[in-house]
């Protein structure tokens, strides 16, 4: 009976999310393997988040709007492990917008989700950021490593969206 009611609840939750995401990929987790964590297909998952790499070339503002329509934001990178996971799926000859910007050019960098910008957990390439005219951040591959660079916001780039996992 308990299992039946949990299944019914799950199905109704799945139906609720189906109007936003036609397909979800779920895995069982938790100490009793009773919780399901899901990401929209074909998003990838890492820890408690889902990631989507958009190959559509758009400005920073349009990239953020594009993520927003999918219930996500441009990616906020919190740890080196998270960055290493993300970069596994990136192409080394491309650049991707992050959810990091400095809209007033005061070198007050801010994350789209209001996560505090911590200078100790940043992965700027050497010498970056280097221009107050360049107010948006990308991640790209340079000098044999992935790192961040400041660029003009209106120049179209690929982008990475991030959302919290859906738990059912």
């Amino acid at each position: 009976n308990f299992m039946y009611s949990k299944t019914v609840k799950r199905l109704s939750k799945l139906q609720e999310y189906q109007q936003y995401y036609p397909s979800l990929t779920c895995v069982m987790e938790g100490k009793d393997m009773e919780d399901w964590s899901c990401c929209p297909t074909p998003w990838t998952s890492f820890q408690s988040s889902c990631y989507f790499i958009s190959t559509v070339m758009q400005s920073w503002t349009k990239s953020q709007n594009n993520c927003s329509v999918m219930g996500a934001d441009l990616v906020v990178i919190n740890t080196k492990e998270e960055q290493d996971f993300i970069t596994q799926n990136l192409k080394i000859n491309s650049a991707y917008f992050l959810g990091l910007s400095d809209p007033k050019g005061w070198r007050h960098w801010q994350w789209v989700d209001q996560t505090p910008y911590n200078k100790n957990v940043t992965f700027w390439h050497s010498g970056e950021p280097n221009s107050p005219d360049e107010r948006c951040a990308i991640i790209n591959f340079r000098s044999e490593e992935w790192g961040w660079n400041d660029v003009h916001c209106h120049v179209p780039q690929k982008s990475i969206c991030k959302m919290k996992k859906i738990y059912i």
Epitope: Q58, T61, P103, S131, D133, C136, H152, C153, H154, P156
Partner: antibody, heavy 121, light 111 residues
Amino acid sequence: EVQLLESGGGLVQPGGSLRLSCAASGFTFSTYTMSWVRQAPGKGLEWVSTINSGGDNTYYPDSVKGRFTISRDNSKNTLYLQMNSLRAEDTAVYYCATYRPYYYGSVLDYWGQGTTVTVSS
Amino acid sequence: DIVLTQSPDSLAVSLGERATINCKASQSVDYDGNSYVNWYQQKPGQPPKLLIYGASNLESGIPDRFSGSGSGTDFTLTISSLQAEDVAVYYCQQSDEDPWTFGGGTKVEIK
């Protein structure tokens, strides 16, 4: 007072090359992103290229990509536009302009008087 | 590319009267409360001159008879009381996304 003085325009045959210069004064050139914009005779304005202050990022529309190269020499306060494989449709007055950011966008706030490029056989 | 369509192509207005120029973008050029549309004035034989940035902000040194409004895809430049020195071609431009694009221009003349 901001001054931008373009030079290097002239008559060139289709397929030929030309190098435009823009001498800047009255502001700290090395800290400014710079752009080129052109205007065909009797027509509207078309953005041609942009270069960031350090010269390491350059941007072009598809119409000139692969043919035009923007560069700068901050020690000489000069902006350049190298134009190769010129076509009749590149005939225009070429303006250099200073770029000023506005949040996530920008404006072109100071413009030179322009230099005329004519591509004709 | 974002296409900007200006209307009318030309406009004849009496001195002291209001002139209104429209600019329509093929997609929204707004983000987070700002609109990325600028207006320029070009007099014969001269380079363009910045009048309005961010849809409604008057550039320093520009007379306050010029004003800009609008958001999303629809923008307007208004000259509240046309002066003889305002005879020119006016262009809108978007800087939301490369390639930057300009409207086709509106020629303002005195009636």
